[in-house]
Interface confidence: low
C-alpha cells in the first residue's frame, strides 16, 4: 500500500465515486469522479497492486473525472485517489480517498439463505430470513417456490437483508438474490432453496425448484 | 523538453561502491514513479529497482540488500547507491520514467556504463 | 533466465509481417498490461506499444499489439530496414517489473 512520508494532517481526504455505478457487467464505460473538498491542482487514481498512479488528470476545479472504458473484469479492484494543490511542496499529496471496490462481472456470487433462528419453526410463529451477499448496497428479493413474483424486495445498505415471515403462511420452500439498485442492472445467481416447516408437521412436499 | 541524464557510471573494483544519479528535466519529478532497469553487455534488460509516489522502494530480489533507490524530489533527481560490487553487475544502467497505464515506462536515459573489475 | 519467455530470434523480408511472441502466467501477463520496447543498436529502449495494444504519439501504426490470456505478440507490418533491433515485452508481476529475454529482428 502507499504510506505517505508527508504529514498530511491539514489535507483532508477527497471522496472516490463510480458512475453508473461500482458493480457492472464487462463493456460499461465506468467513470470514476474523484472529489476534494478543496479545489486543486492535480488527481491521481491509484488502483490496489499497482505501485504507480493509474491515471492522472490536471484541473483547477474540486473534481476530476477518470473514465474506463469498456471496462473489462480485469479492471475491477480496489482504487483510491488523491490530490495535491499547486502551492504545496514537492511530492505532497492529500490523504488517500475512501477505497472504492469496482466489480465487473457477468453475475454477482450466490447469496446464502438461513432462518433466523432456525428452518422449524412452531405454528404461527414469525420466522426471519437473512438472505446475505458479500457486496452492499444490494436490492435483496424473496421468492416462494411455486409463486412466479417476489414475495419482498429490501434495498439494503448491509451486504444482506432480512426479510420477516408473518405466522401461518410460513411453511414452504424459498430462495433469494440480489441485484445491483439500478442500471446496468446485474443479477447475482439464486440462492439455495431453504425449506421452511412447522414443528412436527413431518417431510412436507413441496417443489425445490432450481 | 523531457529528458533524462544518468551520470555516475564508470570503473570499479570487485567489492566496491558506486552511486548513479539521473536529472530529471521537463515535467513534474514528483508525481512520477522513477527505475532502474541495466542491461549486461549482449543481454536483455532487466529491472533493478523502483521509487514510488507513495511509500516504500521496491527491489528485484537479485538486488535486495546491495542497492539502495533514492529520489530528491526538490532537486528532480533519482539515486542508485550500489554496493558489494560483482563482476555480474557489469551493465549499462538506464533510468526510467513509468507512465500511468499499468506500469510501462515511456521514457529513458542514454544509460551510463558501469563497469566491475580488477 | 526470464520469467517472460521470447523466441530469441525472428526474421523477415521488407514488406512482410512479421509477429514476436511472449509467453507468461497468470500471475503476470494474465492479470496484468503488456508492453513492447524496441532497442536499436547503442542505444537505449523505446516504447512501442503499453496497455497491450496502445501506440504512443510517433510510433508508426505498422506496429499492433495484442494479448490473450497469459500471452502476448507484437506484430510488425510492412517491415522495413530500420525495423531491425532486438525487441522486448514486459509485464508486472506482485511488485516488480519481468522482462523477457529479447527477440533480435533481422530484416533480410
Known amino acids: 500500500d502507499f504510506t505517505p512520508t508527508a504529514p498530511l494532517a491539514s489535507y483532508p481526504q477527497p471522496w472516490l465515486g463510480a458512475h453508473p455505478a461500482a458493480v457492472v457487467t464487462p463493456g460499461i464505460n465506468v467513470t470514476l469522479t474523484c472529489r476534494a473538498p478543496q479545489s486543486a491542482w492535480r488527481f491521481a487514481l491509484f488502483k490496489s497492486g499497482l505501485v504507480t498512479p493509474l491515471l492522472l488528470r490536471d484541473v483547477s476545479v474540486e473534481l476530476a473525472e477518470f473514465f474506463l472504458e469498456e471496462v473489462t473484469p480485469a479492471q475491477g479492484g480496489s482504487y483510491h485517489c488523491r490530490y495535491r494543490k499547486t502551492d504545496w511542496g514537492p511530492g505532497v499529496w492529500s490523504q488517500p480517498s475512501n477505497v472504492l471496490e469496482l466489480l465487473v462481472t457477468d453475475q454477482l456470487p450466490r447469496p446464502s439463505l438461513v432462518a433466523l433462528p432456525g428452518p422449524v419453526v412452531a405454528p404461527g410463529a414469525n420466522v426471519s430470513l437473512r438472505c446475505a451477499g458479500r457486496i452492499p448496497g444490494m436490492s435483496f428479493a424473496l421468492y416462494r417456490v411455486g409463486v412466479a413474483t417476489p414475495l419482498q424486495y429490501i434495498d439494503s445498505v448491509q451486504p444482506w437483508a432480512d426479510f420477516l415471515l408473518i405466522g401461518t403462511h410460513t411453511p414452504g420452500t424459498y430462495c433469494c438474490y440480489y441485484h445491483t439498485p439500478s442500471a446496468p442492472y446485474v443479477l447475482s445467481q439464486r440462492s439455495q432453496p431453504l425449506v421452511i416447516s412447522f414443528e412436527g408437521s413431518g417431510s412436507l412436499d413441496y417443489t425445490q425448484g432450481n | 523538453e523531457v529528458q533524462l541524464l544518468e551520470s555516475g557510471g564508470g570503473l570499479v573494483q570487485p567489492g566496491g561502491s558506486l552511486r548513479l544519479s539521473c536529472a530529471a528535466s521537463g515535467f513534474t519529478f514528483s508525481d512520477y514513479y522513477w527505475t532502474w532497469v541495466r542491461q549486461a553487455p549482449g543481454k536483455g534488460l532487466e529491472w533493478v529497482s523502483g521509487?514510488?509516489?507513495?511509500?516504500?522502494?521496491n527491489y528485484a530480489q537479485n538486488f535486495q540488500g546491495r542497492f539502495t533507490i533514492s529520489r530528491d524530489n526538490s532537486k528532480n533527481t533519482l539515486y542508485l547507491q550500489m554496493n558489494s560490487l560483482r563482476a555480474e553487475d557489469t551493465a549499462v544502467y538506464y533510468c526510467?520514467?513509468?507512465?500511468?497505464?499499468?506500469?510501462?515506462?515511456?521514457?529513458w536515459g542514454q544509460g551510463t556504463l558501469v563497469t566491475v573489475s580488477s | 533466465q526470464s520469467v517472460l519467455t521470447q523466441p530469441p530470434s525472428a526474421s523477415g523480408t521488407p514488406g512482410q509481417r512479421v509477429t514476436i511472441s511472449c509467453s507468461g502466467s497468470?500471475?503476470?501477463?494474465?492479470?496484468?498490461?503488456v508492453s513492447w520496447y524496441q532497442q536499436l543498436p547503442g542505444t537505449a529502449p523505446k516504447l512501442l506499444i503499453y496497455g497491450n495494444s496502445n501506440r504512443p504519439s510517433g510510433v508508426p501504426n505498422r506496429f499492433s499489439g495484442s494479448k490473450s490470456g497469459t500471452s502476448a505478440s507484437l506484430a510488425i507490418s510492412g517491415l522495413r530496414s530500420e525495423d531491425e533491433a532486438d525487441y522486448y515485452c514486459q509485464s508486472y508481476d506482485s511488485s516488480s517489473w519481468l522482462f523477457g529475454g529479447g527477440t533480435k529482428l533481422t530484416v533480410l
Open positions: 526510467a520514467k513509468a507512465g500511468f497505464t499499468g506500469g510501462h515506462f515511456d521514457i
Open positions: 497468470s500471475s503476470n501477463i494474465g492479470n496484468n498490461y
Open positions: 521509487s514510488p509516489v507513495f511509500g516504500a522502494a
